[in-house]
Interface confidence: medium
């Protein structure tokens, strides 16, 4: 999916008002310095591509993020403010419902959510030069 035509300011507002709090809740009890940010993004469409990938694609050691509250709100935001996104997700959603897994918080998931926090922060500051 090409995130170029999303309403970035509305997505930012949704992140600041609710998604960010859910990410903090998920990470509660973890030191902010515990994980190094290894995933980066260069502009807002690229950030959303990386955010979608880390949030919804199962990875080795962390297969369970898609049912977390922050993930559900992220998917809602993308469906609402990225034209055509919800249509691309309907089949994926059916498949996800069929393979519901028990939610397990692993260290790998905590690391992944830490990366997500960094990507969202970068999304919110699009004019900053890449380090």
């Amino acid at each position: 999916y090409d995130f170029t035509n999303c309403d970035f300011e509305k997505i930012k507002a949704a992140y600041l008002s609710t998604i960010s709090k859910d990410l903090i809740t998920y990470m509660s009890g973890t030191k902010s310095t515990e994980f190094n940010n290894t995933v980066s993004c260069s502009n807002r469409p690229h950030c959303l591509t990386e955010i979608q990938s880390l949030t919804f694609n199962p990875t080795a050691g962390c297969a369970s993020l898609a049912k977390e509250m922050f993930a559900m709100k992220t998917k809602a935001a993308l469906a609402i403010w990225c034209p055509g996104y919800s249509e691309t997700q309907i089949n994926a959603t059916q498949a996800m419902k069929k393979r519901r897994k028990r939610k397990v918080t692993t260290n790998k998931c905590l690391e992944q959510v830490s990366q997500l926090q960094g990507l969202w922060r970068r999304f919110n500051r699009p004019l900053l030069k890449q380090q």
Epitope: M69, M72, K73, A79
Partner: nanobody
Framework: EVQLVESGGGLVQPGGSLRLSCAAS????????MGWFRQAPGKERELVSA???????YYADSVKGRFTISADNSKNTAYLQMNSLKPEDTAVYYC????FGTGWGQGTLVTVSS
């Protein structure tokens, strides 16, 4: 598939109030969010407010402090309480649940005029 039916619209004077209802044929929180959208003539459909299954809410800047979204899962109904209505709130209001690529209801018309 969940069917959604909106009601409660009408003609109201500026400063007045309306309460919109959205009745769902299935459990409204079997998934995770419901939203109220609106579409004014010649404009794109926009999200007004959303409520999530953890009780958290989202409001567009233009309605913050005036509109309140709520849901009653026992009645499978979501509500939008609209206070201090302005002429620019005039639109057809629609509710949606989770994904809405598969179509919309008829909506309910809200007209704010003196």
């Amino acid at each position: 598939e969940v069917q959604l039916v909106e009601s409660g619209g009408g003609l109201v004077q500026p400063g007045g109030s309306l309460r919109l209802s959205c009745a769902a044929s299935g459990s409204i929180f079997s998934s995770y969010w419901m939203g109220w959208f609106r579409q004014a003539p010649g404009k794109e459909r926009e999200l007004v407010s959303a409520i999530f299954s953890d009780g958290s809410t989202y409001y567009a800047d233009s309605v913050k402090g005036r509109f309140t979204i709520s849901a009653d899962n026992s009645k499978n109904t979501a509500y939008l309480q609209m206070n201090s209505l302005k002429p620019e709130d005039t639109a057809v209001y629609y509710c949606a649940k989770d994904y809405f690529g598969t179509g919309w209801g008829q909506g309910t018309l809200v007209t704010v005029s003196s």
